[in-house]
């Protein structure tokens, strides 16, 4: 019962995870900074790592993707994949899982199949988390490195003077998301597996063999006839034990040299 | 790389109108703010008026009710309209664009200025 209960609760709690790690990688708030203030309007803006939007305290808002953008930086790329590799070991993760699941029955699955496939989805699901964190991780530092390296500094361009503008800048809600999301996927991850090992029965490593007696254990008696050896009475000679398995002797109607005590 | 060109000033009698373009051109993810600012001899640097790309715009008290800031998304193009001129409003007036970096700080590009003289 128990085991049933870390299994399912870690099937639900990996859910909820990979349900977070779909959002915050589809969530546009993983860095938010103010571009543009003056006393009548405000630009807010925030950024995803598929694109960016500008809101103004008008009401105006807009969004572009990334497409237009020469030179992405690397670590985007990176934090892109980790996401993604994440979501899809989550997803395969919770397919096996729901398979895995001891209150699911699936046809004669036998319980260290059971065993195995909760455990391939515990690891998945492991796996899944780090990737999450990872790239949260990732993303949140390149923001920190970023905005220290582009500090206040003026230098003349082709058309004129270029500043570089200090804003202020916060981790938007989908860096905490993820956190979070990868967090549970990874608890999730660690209940099935530990759940894996209450599923796994404790073979021996020896089968037990039984041995049947024949169904033409017979003996001879004076005056040529067949006795039975099974219990109470037999007076018609009538065969009282078959095994099941029908033998080759099985056809012989009467003793003969090859029919043995 | 942006490349910012002013264009529209020059002499003005006192009282007289004056229409200032200002273009951004070159490599850009995204221009969030354009405006005009100006630097009178002797004098800082001075907001005449901005323009967001939402269409927000804000003026100087200075030049409140006599100038009309408009832009051309499109075009990445900002526009000063300024009547009722007076000698106070000669200056080298400079053209600001402000550019989105996604994932860094945001780059203020100025032009190189063009003058405009109030006087009879």
């Known amino acids: 019962m128990a085991v049933t209960a870390c299994q399912g609760l870690g099937f639900v709690v990996s859910l909820i995870g990979i349900a977070g790690i779909i959002a915050a990688t589809c969530m546009d708030q993983w860095s938010t900074q103010d571009l543009y203030n003056n006393p009548v309007t405000a630009v807010f803006n925030y950024q995803g790592l598929w694109r960016s939007c500008v809101r103004e305290s008008s009401g105006f808002t807009e969004c572009r993707g990334y497409f237009t953008l020469l030179g992405l930086p690397a670590m985007l790329q990176a934090v892109r994949a980790l996401m993604i590799v994440g979501i899809v070991l989550g997803a395969i993760g919770l397919l096996v899982s729901i398979f895995a699941l001891k209150c699911i029955r699936i046809g004669s699955m036998e319980d260290s199949a059971k065993a195995n496939m909760t455990l391939t989805s515990g690891i998945m699901f492991i796996v899944s988390g780090l990737c999450a964190i990872a790239g949260v991780s990732v993303f949140a530092n390149m923001l920190v490195t970023n905005f220290w390296m582009s500090t206040a500094n003026m230098y003349t361009g082709m058309g004129g003077m270029v500043q570089t503008v200090q804003t202020r800048y916060t981790f938007g809600a989908a860096l905490f998301v993820g956190w979070v999301a990868g967090g549970l996927t990874l608890i999730g991850g660690v209940m099935m597996c530990i759940a894996c090992r209450g599923l796994a029965p404790e073979e021996t490593n020896y089968k037990a063999v039984s041995y049947h007696a024949s169904g033409h254990s017979v003996a001879y008696k004076p005056g040529g006839f067949k006795a039975s050896t099974g219990f109470g009475s037999n007076t018609k000679n009538k065969k009282i034990y078959d095994g099941g398995a029908r033998t080759e002797d099985e056809v012989q109607s009467y003793p003969s040299k090859h029919d043995y005590v | 790389e942006v490349q910012v060109q002013e264009s529209g000033g020059g002499l003005v009698q006192p009282g007289g109108s004056l229409r200032l373009s200002c273009a951004a051109s070159?490599?850009?993810?995204?221009?969030?703010?354009m405006g005009w600012y100006r630097q009178a001899p002797g004098s800082q640097r001075e907001l005449v008026a901005t323009i967001t790309r939402g269409g927000s715009t804000y003026y100087a008290d200075s030049m409140k009710g006599r100038s009309t800031i408009s832009r051309d998304n499109a075009k990445n193009t900002v526009y000063l309209q300024m009547n009722s001129l007076k000698p106070e409003d000669t200056a080298v007036y400079y053209c600001?664009?402000?550019?989105?970096?996604?994932?860094?700080?945001?780059?203020?590009?100025w032009g190189h200025g063009t003058q405009v003289t109030v006087s009879s």
């Open positions: 600001n664009v402000r550019v989105e970096v996604p994932f860094m700080q945001p780059n203020d590009y």
């Open positions: 070159g490599s850009f993810f995204r221009i969030v703010a």
